[in-house]
C-alpha cells in the first residue's frame, strides 16, 4: 500500500504555482500521534530541497520561507528524524516556477489552395515553464465566429479546419491568440486579412512541353492551375546549371511560350502561381518537368589538322584528325563527319562518311595539289565545312618558328614558347602547336594533339592528354597563305631518372674499331625526355675508372662507333641513359676483345 | 470528459519488454499526479508504479522495482510504463489513473481517481 502523507501534511503559500522571484512558505505538520513515540518533544523535522537539507525543527510543525527557487519543478519532501532510527518521510511537495505568457506576436494566417483550411502561426515567446493554453479565434462578417485551442506546452500552430470561400473576397476576417497560464494571460494583436490575402493556390500541376514541328524555336509550356489563378512565374534552366531563368505573366490561362531555349539541352521548368497582383502570396513552386529540346543543325566549324607521311616516290599517308564540335555547336548527336577528298587541277573529288572516330587516312599521290573538306552531321544537318589545303608544312624554312622551347609548368601543363620566323613576321597567318608522345618507331596510331595560336602570340600552354614521365615530340608551325614552316622541341611535363639504361644486344668489329648497337629504353621505362646516352668501358678485372662516351639522344639512333680501345684485350661495356633529372642504372654488360693489329 | 486511453499491451516471452502508453484528453493533468495499476487474474487491483505532476518523485511497487520505469510528458499529456525482463506472475490487466486534485505527489490505493479502460498483458513462460 502507498503510504504517502499518512503522518502529515506539506502546505505551500501562496500557491504550488508561483512567478519566478516570488517568495514561497512550506510548512510540515505532523497529524496526531505520528510523532517519534514516547519522545514527541524529540521530534525533529527536516526540509529537503531534492536531495538537499535546506531546514530543520524540532516540533510539531516546521515553517520555512523559500526564496530564488530556478524556472521549472521542485520538489520538497519533509521527514522525521527520530533517534536510534531512520529518517520517516512525512510527506512532500512539489513547487512549479514560471513566467506569465509573453504577448504572441507575428501572428499569420494562411489558406493552402481554394479547398484548404485556415491555419494560423505565431511566435509564442520566451518559454513559460508552465502548462498554458493557446485559444485562437476568428471572426469574420456577418458576427460569425470560429475558436480553436491548443493545450500543448509548446503551440504555436492551429489549424481552424474551416474554408474561406471567394464569394466575397474583399470580405474582412479578423484572428486573435490568447496564452493563458496560472500567472497571466496575453493575447496578440489582430491580425486582418480578405480571402484574397491569405489564399496560397496550390502549386500548379499537370506541367507538359510541346514543341511545333520539332523545332526549339516553337515551344509551348502547359500546365493546370487552380480556378482563380491570375499571375504566373516560370523558371527554366538546363539541367547542369545553378541559374534560373524567370519570366511573369498574367492572365497565361495554363500556356506559355518560350522563345531563347537552346537546342539539344535538357531543361529544368518549374511554376508557381498567384490569386492577385498585389495581395496573397505565391504558390510553391510545381512538380520539376524535365524535357529535352529538340536538335537544331550544327554551327560552328570543325576545327581540322592533318599530317603528312612519305611512302615512296609517288605515294603519300594524308592522316586527317578533327576535334568534335562543342555541345553548343554540335546541337544534336553527330551521326557522322562527312570527309570529302579533291584534286584542284583534275577536280576529282572523294566523299566518304565517318561514323566512331575523328580522324581519317587514305593514301594519295604526291602529284597534284589535293584539298579537304570535313563536316559534322546530327538529324537536322551538317555543319559547314571546313576546307584545308595539303602542303607540304614544313617547307618553308624561312617560315620556321626560331627558339622554340618546352618547360614544365606545374603538373601535367608544358609551356612552349618560340620567337617569330625570320621572314616577315606579319606574314603569318597563324601558329599550330602539335604534339605527341614520342615513339622511337615513329608509330603513326600514336594519338595527336593540336591548338591554334593567334599569329601575335609567341607561347602556348598545352595540357590536353598530357602525362607525367612521358616525352612528347612538340612542332611548332607557323601558317602563311599556301605556305608553312615548322620547328620541332621534345618536352616532357614532369621527368626523373630512367629506371633502367639501354640493352646492348651487339658489339661488332670494323676496321680497327667497334659498332655498339643497343635496344631503345621501353616508353614507360624513359620516365621523360631522354637527353644522352652514356656509353662506358673499362678492362675485365681492372679496378681502374672506366671510360665514357657520351652521345646526344637521337629517336631513331640506336648504334654508335667507338675506335679508342686495344687490341687483344678484353673489354667490359655497359650504357646508360639521362634525363635532365639523372642518369639510370646500368643497362646489361657485355665484354669484347679486339682482334685487329697492334698500331 | 475526461479520457484515458491506454495502449502498448499485449503477449511477450518472459524476459521480454513492453512500453505501455496513456494519453489524457479532457482536460490538463500536468499539475496531477499519474499512475499505473494492474489487477491479476482473480486478484484484487494493486498499485505499480505512480509519479508527481512536476515528474521529480516516482514510487514503485517492490515486485517491480529495477525492472519498470515511470516516466511523463506534459507537452504530450501522456503517461509510460517501460516494462522490462517481464515475468509470467506481471501477467494482468493494467489500469492508468490520474489524480483528481492537483499537486498531489502520488496516487492512493483506493483514491477517487480517473481511470482508463485498461490494456492485457501476457507474459507466456
Known amino acids: 500500500k502507498i503510504d504517502a502523507c499518512k503522518r502529515g501534511d506539506v502546505t505551500v503559500k501562496p500557491s504550488h504555482v508561483i512567478l519566478l522571484g516570488s517568495t514561497v512558505n512550506i510548512t510540515c505538520s505532523l497529524k496526531p500521534r505520528q510523532g517519534c513515540f514516547h519522545y514527541s518533544r524529540r521530534n525533529k523535522l527536516i526540509l529537503y530541497k531534492f536531495d538537499r537539507r535546506i531546514n530543520f525543527h524540532h516540533g510539531h510543525s516546521l515553517n520555512s520561507q523559500v526564496t530564488g527557487l530556478p524556472l521549472g519543478t521542485t520538489l520538497f519532501v519533509c521527514k522525521l528524524a527520530c533517534i536510534n532510527s531512520d529518517e520517516i518521510q512525512i510527506c512532500g511537495a512539489e513547487i512549479f516556477v514560471g513566467v506569465a505568457p509573453e504577448q504572441p506576436q507575428n501572428l499569420s494566417c494562411i489558406q493552402k489552395g481554394e479547398q484548404g483550411t485556415v491555419a494560423c502561426t505565431w511566435e509564442r515567446g520566451r518559454d513559460t515553464h508552465l502548462y498554458t493554453e493557446y485559444t485562437l479565434q476568428l471572426s469574420g462578417p456577418k458576427n460569425l465566429t470560429w475558436q480553436k485551442q491548443c493545450k500543448d506546452i509548446y503551440c504555436d500552430y492551429l489549424d481552424f479546419g474551416i474554408n474561406l470561400t471567394p464569394e466575397s473576397p474583399e470580405s474582412n476576417f479578423t484572428a486573435k491568440v490568447t496564452a493563458v497560464n496560472s500567472l497571466g494571460s496575453s493575447s496578440s494583436l489582430p491580425s486582418t486579412f480578405t480571402f484574397l490575402d491569405i489564399v496560397r493556390p496550390l502549386p500548379p500541376w499537370d506541367i507538359r512541353i510541346k514543341f511545333q514541328k520539332a523545332s526549339v524555336s516553337r515551344c509551348t509550356l502547359y500546365w493546370r492551375d487552380e480556378g482563380l489563378v491570375l499571375l504566373n512565374r516560370l523558371r527554366y534552366r538546363p539541367s547542369n546549371s545553378r541559374l534560373w531563368n524567370m519570366v511573369n505573366v498574367t492572365k497565361a490561362k495554363g500556356r506559355h511560350d518560350l522563345l531563347d531555349l537552346k537546342p539539344f539541352t535538357e531543361y529544368e521548368f518549374q511554376i508557381s502561381s498567384k490569386l492577385h497582383l498585389y495581395k496573397g502570396s505565391w504558390s510553391d513552386w510545381s512538380e520539376s518537368l524535365r524535357a529535352q529540346t529538340p536538335e537544331e543543325e550544327p554551327t560552328g566549324m570543325l576545327d581540322v589538322w592533318y599530317m603528312k607521311r612519305h611512302i615512296d616516290y609517288s605515294r603519300q599517308q594524308i592522316s586527317l584528325f578533327w576535334k568534335n564540335l562543342s555541345v553548343s555547336e554540335a546541337r544534336g548527336k553527330i551521326l557522322h563527319y562527312q570527309v570529302t577528298l579533291q584534286e584542284l587541277t583534275g577536280g576529282k573529288a572523294m566523299t566518304q562518311n565517318i561514323t566512331g572516330h575523328t580522324s581519317w587516312t587514305t593514301v594519295i599521290p604526291r602529284t597534284g595539289n589535293w584539298a579537304v573538306a570535313v563536316s559534322a552531321a546530327n538529324s537536322k544537318g551538317s555543319s559547314l565545312p571546313t576546307r584545308i589545303n595539303i602542303m607540304n608544312l614544313c617547307e618553308a624554312g624561312l617560315l620556321a618558328p626560331r627558339q622554340v622551347s618546352a618547360n614544365s609548368e606545374g603538373m601535367d601543363n608544358i609551356l612552349v614558347t618560340w620567337q617569330p620566323p625570320r621572314k616577315d613576321p606579319s606574314a603569318v597567318q597563324e601558329y599550330v602547336v602539335e604534339w605527341r608522345e614520342l615513339h622511337p618507331g615513329g608509330d603513326t596510331q600514336v594519338p595527336l594533339n593540336w591548338l591554334r595560336s593567334r599569329p601575335y602570340n609567341v607561347s602556348a600552354l598545352i595540357s590536353e592528354n598530357i602525362k607525367s614521365y612521358i616525352c612528347y615530340e612538340i612542332r611548332v608551325y607557323a601558317l602563311s597563305g599556301d605556305q608553312g614552316g615548322c620547328s620541332s622541341i621534345l618536352g616532357n611535363s614532369k621527368h626523373k631518372a630512367p629506371l633502367s639504361g639501354p640493352h646492348i644486344n651487339a658489339i661488332t668489329e670494323e676496321k680497327g674499331s667497334i659498332l655498339i648497337s643497343w635496344n631503345s629504353i621501353p616508353v614507360q621505362e624513359q620516365m621523360g625526355c631522354l637527353l644522352h646516352y652514356r656509353i662506358y668501358w673499362k678492362e675485365r678485372d681492372s679496378n681502374s675508372q672506366p671510360q665514357l662516351c657520351e652521345i646526344p639522344y637521337r629517336v631513331s639512333q640506336n648504334s654508335h662507333p667507338i675506335n679508342s680501345l686495344q687490341p687483344r684485350v678484353t673489354y667490359v661495356l655497359w650504357m646508360t641513359a639521362l634525363t635532365a633529372a639523372g642518369e639510370s642504372s646500368h643497362g646489361n654488360e657485355r665484354e669484347f676483345c679486339l682482334q685487329g693489329k697492334a698500331n | 470528459q475526461v479520457q484515458l486511453q491506454e495502449s502498448g499491451g499485449g503477449l511477450v516471452q518472459t524476459g521480454g519488454s513492453l512500453r505501455l502508453s496513456c494519453v489524457a484528453s479532457?482536460?490538463?493533468?500536468?499539475?496531477?499526479?499519474m499512475g499505473w495499476f494492474r489487477q491479476p487474474p482473480g486478484k484484487e487491483r494493486e498499485v505499480v508504479a505512480t509519479?508527481?505532476?512536476?515528474?521529480?518523485?516516482?514510487y514503485y511497487a517492490d515486485s517491480v522495482k529495477g525492472r519498470f520505469t515511470i516516466s511523463r510528458d506534459g507537452a504530450k499529456n501522456t503517461l509510460y510504463l517501460q516494462m522490462n525482463s517481464l515475468k509470467p506472475e506481471d501477467t494482468a490487466v493494467y489500469y492508468c489513473?490520474?489524480?483528481?486534485?492537483?499537486?498531489?505527489?502520488?496516487?492512493?490505493?483506493?483514491?477517487?481517481?480517473?481511470w482508463g479502460q485498461g490494456t492485457q498483458v501476457t507474459v507466456s513462460s
Open positions: 509519479i508527481s505532476g512536476g515528474g521529480t518523485s516516482a
Open positions: 489513473a490520474a489524480d483528481r486534485v492537483d499537486y498531489r505527489m502520488t496516487l492512493t490505493q483506493n483514491g477517487n481517481h480517473y
Open positions: 479532457g482536460r490538463t493533468f500536468n499539475w496531477s499526479a
